[in-house]
Interface confidence: low
């Protein structure tokens, strides 16, 4: 109710003599601070004097002064909330109640804490779960009603009077709730702990043992086992006999079942300590162990390898890889069961032996096509030698071989010609499946491998072919050798080097690009005619009459060529001029007459010049004279001059004879 | 037994040909591979010609690469060394060997069995 | 081409002592694949032919005594000869047989004191 002083502390505190004693302690007074403090040891209450009777062991007054006798026991509250206390050292006699009377300066309060002081260090209180497995981690608990500031202590742990390599956690409480020392231990327990007895020691701070308490572990488990083999090393032949025999060394709790396994597996009807295997087979060889249960579960022995030894059993090869690719490494392995493990292995190749390989593997670094064919082993160990098994084939794949182009014509082939050509190759692993063909053209493919040209062109060639299956070989080119006519035939001027004049010394060239058969002969020809067999054509004088068109055939065996036509043109000065008359040579007076310059020219000519009988130039200078009217005294001798570039020529005289006409002759 | 027999001997001038043959018996001379090794007058060996038991691969040392041919007639049990365009240093003694065994990746290995030798001089 | 070097040139011992000669290559005669050594050792007395000894670096030819031991891997090789005795008067060469072109060391000469 309200009118209590409210007091908060452990209801009991234990230590033992010589060691100490700390209360923690709060209170809240009813109203005001602490004026007076007093603790008593076993209080009574004087109802005669109304005040409480008893040892005396702590007071404090209004001044604060305490007496010096009371250093052993220290009140570490205030005024307010703290009553604290301390006993240091704490002594046999202190046991009982301890009383706290509170002064403040209306109300009054006796507050009771019991303190229980042992003649000697109590033991701490070890906890365990209420069951403990193997294998499963639990925690250990000791824990000891005691904590004081000014006494350190210690727990440890021991197994067996061991100290424990586990790390303990230790942890005081020392608050108005409760006051302890406790040490915690996380362990696993194995099989083999069980019945062991473990210790929780109390030491002081120098490790000296104050006390102890101590436990021992039951540690449930499945059954634990040993299983003895005869023979010993377990190594058998086929027909010899066995027993194994499995011993329960431990078991919390008690076994029930037994049964013995080989790889995992429940050997049926064997649930005896005993087993025994008559006339053993290779197929009994494997891993036994026996299998005992419990409450907690099934235990097993460690397995027994048991080896019944065997001649090698027929062998098969394994090959990495096939199919190969020719210059790839290749390994074969020879696979056969036996026990022992053979020691010794004959390779075949195509049933002829191996010289030298006698391991399980061989390998090849670099595959070469005759490596092809069926690989077989023979495995052999102390019992005995294998059978030859049925073998691996090694399938060696590598690009065509020798391919070569063939020509399928006559020889020799002429352009025009329908020209077969055939892709030929040795060996090829896998099959070819096309063929490439060089120079790319629109050429028909009649058959695989074979290549038709149609109107061979003078300029082909070489051809070559590739057959391919997954890789493409190449032939070496094949010369077509076409024959063809003559090309490109011209005629070619060689001298002189500008143009022909009348007279110069002329040689014309027959030419032509190519020719197959390069044996040729030529033929020179003008207007119809042959004028040479010669590759040139000589003029040593040409004249004007030479001019014309030419044309030179070129021929080989195969056919000939015409050049086109070349003019052969030939400069000159103006020759031949002659004056002709019109209408004639006698004309009447008054008529008209034209003298015309006529010549032969080349190039033609360019300028005229008139001449009368006197040599006397006349002014006019084209190729005709017209005289209208004429006159009689223009009868006379006329010639005129023709020039060209290349120089000029002159004409003989003409004379025109001017004849009077009837009307002068009738006047006269 | 193993026998290898040379023969082919004799004194060339340099530019010269010689062709050598081995006889071989006491085995299964097809299933085997062949080589052509030779020793110096210093008494130094050299590996000369290679030839697979089926003939179809041949291996030849870079002093005699495109002057020595080696082959092999099976049907005679015979293998054979023509040498072209001699020069003084081809003078040795010139060795028919037999490989190891008939198959061993298809390279030249050791050399199990020897033939006595062929003497071969090369001088003007 | 891999360059074989024997060692000493020649060496003279008394019948009853242990011989040891070398050969070193110029690079590694093992195989990765197989882990074997791709070395040989023949024996030539005078005006014989040579005769194989050993292959694989240490597998003896049959019929050869088991005095003669090879040992030795990667470059470094030993061809050991226990208790010499008079008929062993040889010179001794070694031959890679680990790519074309084969070679052969100079050789051993072994003379007795």
């Known amino acids: 109710d309200s009118s209590k002083w409210v007091f908060e502390h452990p209801e009991t505190l234990y230590a033992w003599e010589g060691a100490c004693v700390w209360i923690p302690c709060t209170y809240r007074a009813l109203d005001g601070d602490l004026e007076s403090f007093i603790l008593f040891h076993n209080p009574e209450y004087n109802k005669n004097t109304s005040k409480f009777d008893g040892t005396r062991l702590y007071e404090s007054t209004k001044d604060g002064k305490v007496p010096s006798e009371q250093k052993r026991v220290q009140f570490l509250g205030d005024k307010n909330k703290n009553c604290t206390l301390s006993i240091h050292p704490v002594h046999l006699n202190d046991s009982g109640q301890l009383g706290l009377r509170m002064e403040s300066k209306t109300e009054k309060w006796m507050e009771r804490i019991h303190l229980n002081v042992s003649e000697r260090p109590f033991p701490p209180h070890i906890q365990l779960p209420p069951e403990i497995q193997e294998s499963q981690e639990v925690t250990l608990t000791c824990l000891l009603n005691f904590s004081c500031y000014g006494y350190p202590i210690q727990l440890q742990w021991l197994l067996e009077g061991v100290p424990m390599r586990q790390a303990a956690v230790t942890s005081t409480s020392l608050t108005i709730k409760s006051v302890f020392t406790r040490s915690e231990l996380k362990f696993s327990p194995q099989w083999s702990h069980h019945g062991k007895i473990v210790t929780c020691q109390l030491q002081d701070a120098d490790g000296k043992f104050l006390s102890n308490d101590t436990v021992q572990l039951n540690v449930k488990h499945t059954p634990k086992l040993e299983i003895k083999v005869t023979p010993s090393d377990a190594i058998v032949r086929e027909g010899d006999s066995v027993t194994m025999t499995c011993e329960v060394s431990s078991s919390n709790p008690e076994y029930t079942t037994v049964s013995w396994l080989k790889d995992g597996t429940s050997l049926k009807k064997q649930n005896t300590f005993t087993l025994n295997l008559r006339e053993v087979t290779k197929d009994q060889s494997g891993k036994y162990c026996c299998q005992v249960s419990n409450d907690v579960g099934p235990g097993r022995s460690e397995e027994v390898f048991l080896q019944v030894q065997y001649a090698p059993e027929p062998s098969t090869v394994q090959i990495l890889h096939s199919p190969a690719v020719e210059g790839s490494q290749v390994e074969f392995l020879c696979m056969s069961l036996a026990n022992p493990l053979p020691t010794n292995y004959t390779w075949y190749h195509n049933g002829k032996e191996m010289q030298g390989r006698t391991e399980e593997k061989v390998h090849i670094p670099k595959i070469l096509p005759w490596h092809a064919g069926t690989y077989s082993c023979v495995a052999e160990n102390i019992l005995g030698t294998g059978q030859r098994g049925p073998g691996a084939e090694l399938d060696v794949q590598y690009p065509p071989k020798k391919v070569t182009t063939v020509i399928q014509n006559p020889m020799p082939i002429r352009e025009g010609d329908t020209v077969t050509l055939s892709c030929n190759y040795n060996s090829s692993n896998p099959s070819v499946t096309r063929y490439e063909w060089k120079p790319h053209g629109a050429w028909e493919e009649p058959s695989l491998g074979v290549l038709k040209i149609q109107n061979v062109g003078w300029d082909n060639t070489t051809i070559a072919c590739a057959a391919c299956n997954s890789w493409c070989s190449w032939a070496s080119p094949v010369a077509l050798n076409v024959q063809y006519a003559p090309r490109d035939v011209r005629v070619r001027k060689i001298k002189p080097l500008s143009e022909i004049h009348s007279g110069n010394s002329v040689s014309l060239q027959c030419d032509f690009s190519s020719s197959h058969p390069k044996e040729v002969q030529f033929f020179w020809e003008k207007n119809g005619r042959l004028l040479g067999k010669e590759s040139q054509l000589n003029f040593d004088s040409i004249s004007p009459e030479d001019a014309g068109s030419y044309s030179c055939w070129v021929n080989n065996s195969i056919g000939q060529t015409a050049s086109k036509a070349w003019t052969l043109e030939v400069l000159y000065a103006p020759r031949r001029l002659r004056v002709s008359m019109s209408p004639g040579d006698q004309v009447m007076e008054g008529k008209s007459a034209t003298l015309t310059c006529e010549s032969d020219a080349n190039p033609p000519v360019s300028h005229y010049t008139w001449f009368d009988w006197n040599n006397q130039s006349l002014p006019y200078h084209s190729q005709k004279l017209r005289l209208e009217p004429v006159k009689v005294q223009h009868s006379g001798a006329y010639w005129c001059q023709g020039t060209n570039s290349v120089g000029k020529g002159r004409s003989p005289l003409s004379t025109l004879t001017v004849y009077y006409s009837p009307e002068t002759i009738g006047r006269r | 037994d193993v026998k290898l027999v040379e023969s082919g001997e004799g004194l060339v001038k340099p530019g010269g040909s010689l062709k050598l043959s081995c006889a071989a018996s006491?085995?299964?001379?097809?299933?085997?591979?062949m080589s052509w090794v030779r020793q110096t007058p210093e008494k130094r060996l050299e590996w000369v010609a290679y030839?697979?038991?089926?003939?179809?691969?041949?291996y030849y040392a870079d002093t005699v690469k495109g002057r020595f041919t080696i082959s092999r007639d099976d049907a005679r049990n015979t293998l054979y060394l023509q040498m072209s365009s001699l020069k003084s240093e081809d003078t040795a003694m010139y060795y028919c060997t037999r490989d190891q065994g008939y198959y061993y990746d298809g390279r030249p290995t050791w050399f199990a069995y020897w033939g006595q030798g062929t003497l071969v001089t090369v001088s003007a | 081409d891999i360059v074989m070097i024997q060692s000493p040139s020649s060496l003279a011992m008394s019948v009853g002592q242990k011989v040891t000669m070398r050969c070193k290559s110029s690079q590694s005669l093992l195989s990765s694949s197989n882990q074997k050594n791709y070395l040989a050792w023949y024996q030539q007395k005078p005006g014989q032919s040579p005769k194989l000894l050993v292959y694989?670096?240490?597998t003896r030819e049959s019929g050869v005594p088991d005095r003669f031991i090879g040992s030795g891997s990667g470059t470094d090789f030993t061809l050991t000869i226990n208790s010499v005795q008079a008929e062993d008067l040889a010179d001794y060469f070694c031959?890679?047989?680990?790519?074309?072109?084969?070679?052969f060391g100079a050789g051993t000469k072994l003379e007795l004191k």
């Open positions: 694989f670096a240490s």
């Open positions: 006491g085995f299964t001379f097809s299933s085997y591979a």
């Open positions: 031959q890679q047989h680990y790519s074309t072109p084969l070679t």
């Open positions: 030839i697979t038991s089926g003939g179809d691969y041949i």
